[in-house]
């Protein structure tokens, strides 16, 4: 039997049953999430659930730029350091950089400081690039 790999929307890239879209536009976290949702298919800001997934994403983004942080779907909606993925995925894999997570920083970004392999918290109203994800 021939197993067909599902196709992603134009410009989105495929990895292990998911499609990813890297948006090089500036949006605050909530506007980025709304834009992801606007593409349908259950798209949200991306959850990153393993080192393998993180490495694939990081390699892809590094082909475009190495200096701008990128919003992902991890946030702290109750502002109590209770982080959760906006798409409902289990918060098991963690890749925080060593920076302090205090202050008014309740949204997570992939940090350019470690080639996008680690995360930092940031103020949710900051306008940044963002990464969307859906399962085709």
């Amino acid at each position: 039997d021939i197993i067909m790999r599902p196709s992603c929307a134009p410009g989105w890239f495929y990895h292990k049953s998911n499609c990813y879209g890297y948006f090089r536009k500036l949006r605050n976290w909530s506007d980025a999430e709304l834009e992801c949702q606007s593409y349908g298919n259950g798209a949200h800001l991306a959850s990153i659930l393993s080192l393998k997934e993180a490495s694939t994403i990081a390699e892809y983004i590094s082909g475009y730029q190495r200096s701008q942080p990128i919003w992902i779907g991890l946030h702290d909606p109750q502002k109590r350091q209770q982080w959760q993925w906006i798409d409902g995925a289990m918060y098991l894999y963690r890749s925080w950089s060593g920076k302090s997570m205090g202050g008014n920083k309740h949204c997570a970004e992939m940090s350019s400081n470690n080639n996008f392999l680690t995360w930092s918290s940031n103020e949710c109203n900051k306008r940044q690039h963002f990464l969307c994800k859906y399962r085709p």
């Epitope: 134009p10 410009g11 989105w12 879209g21 090089r24 536009k25 082909g63 475009y64 730029q65 200096s67």
Partner: antibody, heavy 121, light 109 residues
Framework: EVQLLESGGGLVQPGGSLRLSCAAS????????MSWVRQAPGKGLEWVSA????????YYADSVKGRFTISRDNSKNTLYLQMNSLRAEDTAVYYC??????????????WGRGTTVTVSS | FMLTQPHSVSESPGKTVTLSCTRS????????VQWYQQRPGSSPILVIF?????PSGVPDRFSGSIDSTSNSASLTISGLQSEDEGDYYC?????????FGGGTKVTVL
Amino acid sequence: EVQLLESGGGLVQPGGSLRLSCAASGFTFSSYAMSWVRQAPGKGLEWVSAISGSGGSTYYADSVKGRFTISRDNSKNTLYLQMNSLRAEDTAVYYCARGAGATPFNAFDIWGRGTTVTVSS
Amino acid sequence: FMLTQPHSVSESPGKTVTLSCTRSSGSISFDYVQWYQQRPGSSPILVIFEDDQRPSGVPDRFSGSIDSTSNSASLTISGLQSEDEGDYYCQTYDDNRQVFGGGTKVTVL
């Protein structure tokens, strides 16, 4: 008043060199990325090269890579384009354009009047 | 990738024209699209930035939009006036380079 003024264009033989300058005024020059965009006679716009506000990052179109060098002197508020190994297809009006931010990939919100480069024997 | 624009468009004063800009590969949504107006003998002027934003001084007759289904951007000029005549270029970027469309010549009849 925000202004960009190009100079240095002229007639040059194929294989020759030319250095274009763009004098900026009316804004904090070092806070903005800058680009060169050209327009061949009767043709459309073609991006040539870009440089970040600090000058630390430079970018080139494939058509000029290895022949042209972009640079800036923030103390003089001036952008440069050193053009070597010129070809007939480099004949164009060269515009200096300001990017809307410190990184090169933004809108071009201010344009100069352009300087004409003619490559011919 | 390339940005493809129709070569020319003509319309009467007061009417509305919509110019298209289609991206050949990659998603039009991933990067901002800008639009520039170039009147004959003049330098280009930014009329739309970041897909749909108008710089101060540009009339609200100019509007921009993105359609991910057709993978294209559009510039709409309503209430067409004689001074709108000229060439219009879309522009975006990808992989450390800027890309312009070939331009659309707008003629006001």
